[in-house]
Amino acid sequence: EVEKTACPSGKKAREIDESLIFYKKWELEACVDAALLATQMDRVNAIPFTYEQLDVLKHKLDELYPQGYPESVIQHLGYLFLKMSPEDIRKWNVTSLETLKALLEVNKGHEMSPQVATLIDRFVKGRGQLDKDTLDTLTAFYPGYLCSLSPEELSSVPPSSIWAVRPQDLDTCDPRQLDVLYPKARLAFQNMNGSEYFVKIQSFLGGAPTEDLKALSQQNVSMDLATFMKLRTDAVLPLTVAEVQKLLGPHVEGLKAEERHRPVRDWILRQRQDDLDTLGLGLQGGIPNGYLVLDLSMQEALS
């Protein structure tokens, strides 16, 4: 806290300008009017204030707006945003995408800070859903943003927003998140033709069910091994050897290198060795010829 002292004669600030860098902390407190500061916030970033001086300026704004800053001030905070705590930001009501962009720009190139996370949370909650423009903006600044959301939060993403998602935005998503995003992507891209559809849906396939993989296998998509390895194990297991061969096309040869890893390993264990041999890849571990396969889950359903 800066002690309250009278402003020395002739030092009252008429505008926010560079002369203020020579003011001591107590002089800034005494001589800079908070309302003047609020209306000229855009100038603060152009002036090389020290950290200690910035603390005083923030303190003045906090006193002027104890319930939280208005958006007109927030939009021009610039680097002063880095001095805000998550508690400060929770008091804000940020509705303009331009304001959000201006503040994200300040933090550009850095990890998502608690301040930024709180800001985004406030913004998205204020909007009620993650619309396309917001998602576009957020993933541009933070490619991993989408995968930082819980499945519950992802459920508020409208299918139309999926068009803004790039493959790298999904790199760190886990299966639970892809389970939520895949149906939205399927809906978003439903009117596209086969090859174009596959290009768009490919990044989301970690959430695809068996029936959709079976359908894709009929479309000559030539799925690469990297995508196949990200598929849900429970979705891959029911696929036949013929279906996997069609799904992977020329990439089927890659199964040999992945035979010890999931989901390939588990899938091999479910296939007849005879069928695996037809691939000519030397895959081992299938069900020996003459063995009867009982599907216990089916038996339970019947009883």
Partner: nanobody, 128 residues
Framework: EVQLVESGGGLVQPGGSLRLSCAAS????????MGWFRQAPGKGRELVAA????????YYPDSVEGRFTISRDNAKRMVYLQMNSLRAEDTAVYYC?????????????????????WGQGTQVTVSS
């Protein structure tokens, strides 16, 4: 290598004038606040004048206000201190100093310990 070289000091009578100069090299001069400090025997170092990187704003403590004028020429990488109406108490070694001016820097622009680079100093003696 950063160098600040002061010149222009000397012996002057009370009421007289002197003009100190400081030539800077090895720094991006236009990014620095420049200051003149002085240190009298047995006393601490005090700021007598400072000027913003652009040259648009200046600072003087009450003790020299109206008598001293700081200026700079960014093209020539020079900073000057015009001292008029000199008094015996202005006798000291005068130092040129530079502090990098950037948003969110440490400390303040008045404390000598926050300045990054220093000259060797030039002696100013005011005596009859």
């Amino acid at each position: 290598e950063v160098q600040l070289v002061e010149s222009g000091g000397g012996l002057v009578q009370p009421g007289g004038s002197l003009r100190l100069s400081c030539a800077a090299s090895g720094i991006t001069f236009s990014n620095y606040v420049m200051g003149w400090f002085r240190q009298a025997p047995g006393k601490g170092r005090e700021l007598v004048a400072a000027i913003t990187a652009s040259g648009g704003n200046t600072y003087y403590p009450d003790s020299v206000e109206g008598r001293f004028t700081i200026s700079r020429d960014n093209a020539k990488r020079m900073v000057y201190l015009q001292m008029n109406s000199l008094r015996a108490e202005d006798t000291a070694v005068y130092y040129c100093a530079a502090k990098r001016a950037y948003w969110g820097s440490d400390g303040d622009y008045q404390g000598y310990y926050y300045y990054d680079y220093w000259g060797q100093g030039t002696q100013v003696t005011v005596s009859s």
